[in-house]
């Protein structure tokens, strides 16, 4: 069967990293630069992915096969296969429309990347704080006053005052 | 503290290969986002990008030096290596490593000169 | 290659008084909001210093009378009110697109 498709289309014998140049009797033509063929018996090179901007090259294009992005340090990969690319933020930040901005009072956020999200409400489980929450860190909670035993006490430090206005990074 | 010092043979022939070292401290590549480049500056002219390499050791070169050009990395030990084959006068300057983060050279060394002469 | 052109070429400022210095790049240096070019300070003798990131964005411990502002192909550096200190040799940078490249300079000096 290789042998009768081969007769039939001389394309067919072209290898990945070449095309079958209809300009010059179906010849196999080494892919121009900045273009790949990852399969054989095609009729046109693909042109290569650029990495530019936010938009690092993690793999140079090669005759047969594509360039490979990832995001330049100080950002991070969306989507599939890295097709965006969002900035960084640091711990106890969270990205917005003008930059990244502090946690507001009450929220944290231990990544460089994702929402601020509330601090756990220890009551709600009928436990005490431990230790106090900040804008990079959850709280920590600690057993419910009832779980102590006679005669200890749970301290419970107080919240730390409010913070000061948000400013950008 | 970020500091870089670079370190090469001051003189060369021309087409010998000239070999630069980057001894840096107060950062490690092989933390995430870290990187080394090579900058060179001919007396009393500017600044030209030669190559990177990054903490997960992908390296990048000038396309019009490339052929010339091989960046390498000992982590360890903390230091950064450039080669660049077949000088000529023409490569006489000053030879910066810098700190990368985010794509800017954050930090530079002190700059190690190098002449290429008969 | 992104050529960079920077003016002027050299300018004599009054102490005290603003300088402003422009980068202009043959095409956008402009990411997903981002714009990736960057300024540095050289003086006589000494390596480069990194002053703004990403055209507007002042780095750690550098005064702020040094500000960027500009996108897609026109930057801007300007110092507020100009100090002895300053004398030294301005870069802009484009790290948008390999090669990475550098404008030819603008000298500083005090009038």
């Known amino acids: 069967f290789e042998r009768t498709r081969s007769l039939q289309d001389p394309c067919s014998n072209c290898p990945a990293g070449t095309f079958c140049d209809n300009n010059r009797n179906q010849i196999c033509s080494p892919c121009p630069p900045n273009s790949f063929s990852s399969a054989g018996g095609q009729r046109t090179c693909d042109i290569c992915r650029q990495c530019k901007g936010v938009f690092r090259t993690r793999k140079e294009c090669s005759s047969t096969s594509n360039a490979e992005c990832d995001c330049t340090p100080g950002f991070h990969c969306l989507g599939a296969g890295c097709s965006m690319c969002e900035q960084d933020c640091k711990q106890g930040q969270e990205l917005t429309k003008k930059g990244c901005k502090d946690c507001c009072f009450g929220t944290f956020n231990d990544q460089k990347r994702g929402i601020c999200r509330p601090w756990t409400n220890c009551s709600l489980d009928g436990k005490s704080v431990l230790v106090n929450g900040t804008k990079e860190r959850d709280v920590v909670c600690g057993p419910s006053p009832a779980d102590l035993s006679p005669g200890a006490s749970s301290v419970t430090p107080p919240a730390p005052a409010r913070e000061p206005g948000h400013s950008p990074q | 503290q970020v500091t870089l010092k670079e370190s090469g043979p001051g003189i060369l022939q021309p087409s010998q290969t000239l070999s630069l070292t980057c001894s840096f401290s107060?950062?490690?590549?092989?933390?995430?986002?870290?990187?080394v480049g090579w900058i060179r500056q001919p007396s009393g002219k500017g600044l030209e990008w030669l190559a990177h390499?990054?903490?997960?050791?992908?390296?990048r070169y000038n396309p019009a030096l490339k052929s010339r050009l091989t960046i390498s990395k000992d982590t360890s030990s903390s230091q950064v290596f450039l080669k660049i084959a077949s000088v000529d006068t023409a490569d006489t300057a000053t030879y910066y490593c810098?700190?990368?983060?985010?794509?800017?050279?954050?930090?530079w060394g002190q700059g190690t000169l190098v002449t290429v002469s008969a | 290659d992104i050529v960079l052109t920077q003016s002027p070429d050299s300018l004599a400022v009054s102490l005290g008084q603003r300088a402003t210095i422009s980068c202009r790049a043959s095409e956008s240096v402009d990411s997903y909001g981002h714009s990736f070019m960057h300024w540095y300070q050289q003086k006589p003798g000494q390596p480069p210093k990194l002053l703004i990131y990403?055209?507007?964005n002042l780095e750690s411990g550098i005064p702020a009378r040094f500000s960027g502002s500009g996108s897609r192909t026109d930057f801007t550096l300007t110092i507020n009110v100009v100090e002895a200190d300053d004398v030294a040799t301005y870069y802009c940078h484009q790290s948008y697109e390999e090669p990475w490249t550098f404008g030819g300079g603008t000298k500083l000096e005090i009038k």
């Open positions: 990403r055209a507007s």
């Open positions: 390499i990054w903490w997960d050791d992908v390296k």
């Open positions: 107060g950062f490690s590549l092989s933390t995430s986002g870290m990187g």
């Open positions: 810098a700190q990368m983060t985010s794509s800017v050279f954050a930090y």
